[in-house]
């Protein structure tokens, strides 16, 4: 499929101008190429009329031109003093003309309307209102005003003075008489439907003098804005119907077959399945403006997009409308990545999340789609070391492994962590890309103990039990603040006995935290990588009290107590159920938070991406 | 939960200069942003000033730009409000705020947040 994208249809009227702008991926090769505009004749061949070369034709002489924006990567062919004779079906391309790299688009000029003396010409767009003046003279003060339209060579009664409403018109026409002092009546008609456009004569009196005055009705179908954006990107419809609708539901719907347009999302609370996670609509303003994004481009999303006001929430005749022709450009410059992520409850799961590789220094975020109301994305996690408080010692987000790709990790997972996550940066370059994490039947692959309580001024040693399957990555132990995770030392204590069926490859790693202090209470992290791709972690509180008795603390043996979370293994190794914990004062002494902001330094973790479309929290 | 604690109000000229702090205590890791409120005798609370914790951005209310500037200094939890060139229509009680939930809507990448933490407020008073 050519990506080349322009307008399908443009139409004009004799004597005006119009300008057609036609969008390219601005790749370098595609900005500096030629750049064309070419008529297509009847046996297939396409007629160069003007191009970025300098070439003009002669039936283009003096009132066309084409221009170039490789910065935007589109261009723009004018035409002027428009005849019968420009319409036709032409291409605008790049390269050589019978190469493909082009978009076919159809020009219409209609001859001008054929007007009789004194007609004012009223342009109104669809779904808007007109008031057409009618003025009279004194003698036809007292007598019945009326609006007439002509149908073929008949004139059809509208609506007049006595009270009669043609029924095509009921609801939404209403005939006002100026005060005293002003010689003139006006027709208002709101809700313009396509089928109002046409011929009307006002009328002060039925005799032979009456005062009469011709109109000329125009009801334009708004000309759709083009849009051209990434496959995986995200595109933002911006809809500002005015304040008279700034009470009725709006939506934005896409226009299937014929004239059916079926609704994307609504004020009403109504949202296509097949955006489910990937759309927002914002609350609206009180002029009636509103807008939606809408991340993830699918190829299938292409196509004609409207926004309106309607009390039902959808399409109807007379409704105000914007236009949109949306293509998907599939030579996108976004990478793919996993839309689907998988992790067990009680396991952990690690995002990547592309960005524009320039803009290395831009915030990164993460956030929850919530689809409640129209949609919110409430920010769990970002960059510059903020997560979310519910979020504390099981989320991270680190800039590894660069290079155009940051990672997210969260564990302690929950079904409740099941849903839409946006990738984000504040960067120009407006990348959002959407990942559904889903959690699935299964047990964790790395074990550790619950929460353990560290004694002041003694030694900690605290186990992690990696499956076989993790022989061959780099093990690891970190302490969690809210900038990352940090490296510390561990040691690997030989084969683990916490796996069934596992070969001496399972391996058991500890942390040792030697003469704990205060400082060492908070969140540890032990996983897996394979160098800045991070796989499984799992989380263990560490919670310090004062000294009770002497001796060291090695928390790998099961205890008879054990909780009721907790099942005992044959190993001897008690399995925890990591439940996600809101706060660690349910363990520990209240205690003031600090702030771990500037701790910025240090080890910061990543994941195998698994399938192109799919990632599993664990890593296979 | 986040607590705030204002100081630094007081009585001052007009054209005079005051600094008001807010030491912040608790989950201040989930603190998104700060902000200072008002409140004048029988009116609305209304906004004056707001940072991001991590200083990169700050908005101010028309009436307070260019004489009143918002800052933060992270090692000790606190942000100020520098109030220069003082009115007797700045005189009302200035609040503290923290948020904590910022989010998404369409007019990303603009960041939202709603102030859902408040200290008690301290008195600032401005003679003619």
């Known amino acids: 499929k050519s990506p080349i994208f322009g307008p399908e249809e443009v139409n004009s009227v004799e004597g005006n101008s119009v300008s057609i702008t036609c969008y390219y991926p601005p790749t370098s090769v595609n900005r500096h190429t030629r750049k064309y505009w070419c008529r297509q004749g009847a046996r297939g061949g396409c007629i160069t009329l003007i191009s970025s070369e300098g070439y003009v034709s002669s039936k283009y002489a003096g009132r066309a031109n084409l221009t170039n924006f490789p910065e935007n990567g589109t261009f723009v062919v004018n035409i002027a003093q428009l005849s019968q004779d420009d319409s036709g079906r032409y291409k605008c391309g790049l390269g050589i003309n019978s190469r493909g790299l082009s978009f076919d688009v159809s020009l219409e000029v209609s001859q001008g309307p054929g007007l009789l003396n004194d007609t004012k010409v009223y342009t109104v767009d669809l779904g808007r209102t007109v008031t057409i003046n009618c003025p009279f003279k004194t003698e036809n003060a007292q007598k019945r005003k009326s609006l007439y339209k002509q149908i073929g060579l008949y004139p059809v009664l509208v609506i007049d003075s006595s009270g009669y409403v043609n029924p095509n018109y009921t609801g939404r026409i209403r005939l006002d008489i100026q005060g005293t002092g002003q010689l003139l009546f006006s027709v208002v008609i709101n809700q313009l439907r396509l089928s109002d456009a046409g011929q009307y004569l006002c009328q002060a009196g039925d005799d032979s003098n009456s005062n009469k005055k011709n109109a000329d009705l125009q009801v334009l179908k708004p000309e759709p804005e083009l849009v051209y954006e990434d496959l995986r990107g995200s595109v933002t419809f911006h809809c500002a119907l005015g304040p008279e609708v700034a009470n009725v539901a709006k939506f934005l719907c896409r226009q299937s077959s014929g004239e059916n347009c079926d609704v994307v999302v609504n004020t009403l609370g109504k949202r296509a399945p097949a955006f489910e996670g990937r759309i927002l609509l914002n609350p609206q303003d009180k002029d009636g403006s509103f807008s939606v994004v809408i991340t993830g481009l699918r190829k299938e999303d292409a196509g004609r997009y409207l926004c309106g006001a309607h009390s039902d929430g959808q399409l109807q005749e007379g409704s105000p409308i914007q236009a949109w022709q949306l293509f998907v450009n599939e030579e996108s410059t976004i990478p793919r990545s996993p839309t689907v992520v998988k992790g067990v409850a009680g396991g952990s799961v690690a995002v990547l999340c592309p960005y524009n590789r320039k803009e290395s220094k831009s915030i990164k975020y993460w956030c929850l789609w919530e689809g409640a109301q129209n949609g919110r994305c409430p920010l769990l996690v970002d960059s510059e070391g903020w997560v979310k408080a519910q979020y504390e010692g099981r989320l991270s987000l680190l800039e590894e492994p660069g290079n155009g790709t940051f990672t997210v990790i969260l564990n302690q997972l929950t079904s409740r962590d099941a849903g839409f996550y946006w990738c984000l940066t504040n960067g120009d370059t407006l990348w959002r890309t959407t990942v559904e994490i889903k959690i699935i039947e299964g047990e964790p692959n790395l074990k550790v103990p619950g929460n353990v309580t560290a004694v002041l001024g003694e030694t900690l040693k605290v186990p992690c039990h990696f499956p076989c399957k993790f022989s061959s990555y780099e093990k690891y132990w970190c302490k969690w603040n809210n900038t990352g995770c940090q490296a510390l030392p561990s040691q690997d204590e030989g084969p683990s006995k916490a796996f069934v069926n596992c070969d001496e490859n399972s391996r058991l790693v500890s942390l040792t935290l030697n003469l704990v202090t205060r400082a060492d209470e908070g969140w540890y992290w032990c996983g897996v990588k394979q160098g800045h791709f991070y796989g499984e972690t799992a989380a263990v509180y560490v919670a310090v009290e004062e000294r009770k008795a002497a001796g060291s603390r090695d928390v790998s043996l099961a205890k008879a107590d054990a909780a009721p979370d907790e099942k005992v293994l044959d190993s001897g190794f008690r399995e925890i159920e990591n439940k996600a914990i809101q706060d660690p004062r349910l363990f520990a002494e209240e205690k003031a938070v600090a702030d771990t902001r500037d701790q910025a330094d240090g080890s910061r973790a990543s994941v195998d991406s698994g399938s192109s479309e799919e990632q599993g929290g664990s890593s296979r | 939960q986040v607590q705030l604690v204002e100081s630094g109000g007081g009585l001052v000229q007009a054209g005079g200069s005051l600094r008001l702090s807010c030491a912040a205590s608790g989950r201040t890791f989930s603190v998104y942003a700060m902000g200072w409120f008002r409140q004048a005798p029988g009116k609305e609370r209304q906004f004056v000033a707001a940072i991001t914790w991590s200083g990169g951005s700050t908005s101010y209310a028309d009436s307070v730009k260019g004489r009143f500037t918002i800052s933060r200094d992270n090692a000790k939890n606190t942000v100020y409000l520098q109030m220069n060139i003082l009115k007797p229509e700045d005189t009302a009680v200035y609040y503290c705020?923290?948020?904590?939930?910022?989010?998404?809507?369409?007019?990303?990448?603009?960041?939202?947040?709603?102030?859902?933490?408040w200290g008690q407020g301290t008195l600032v008073t401005v003679s003619s």
């Open positions: 705020a923290a948020a904590t939930n910022p989010y998404f809507s369409d007019y990303y990448p603009d960041l939202k947040y709603e102030f859902d933490y």
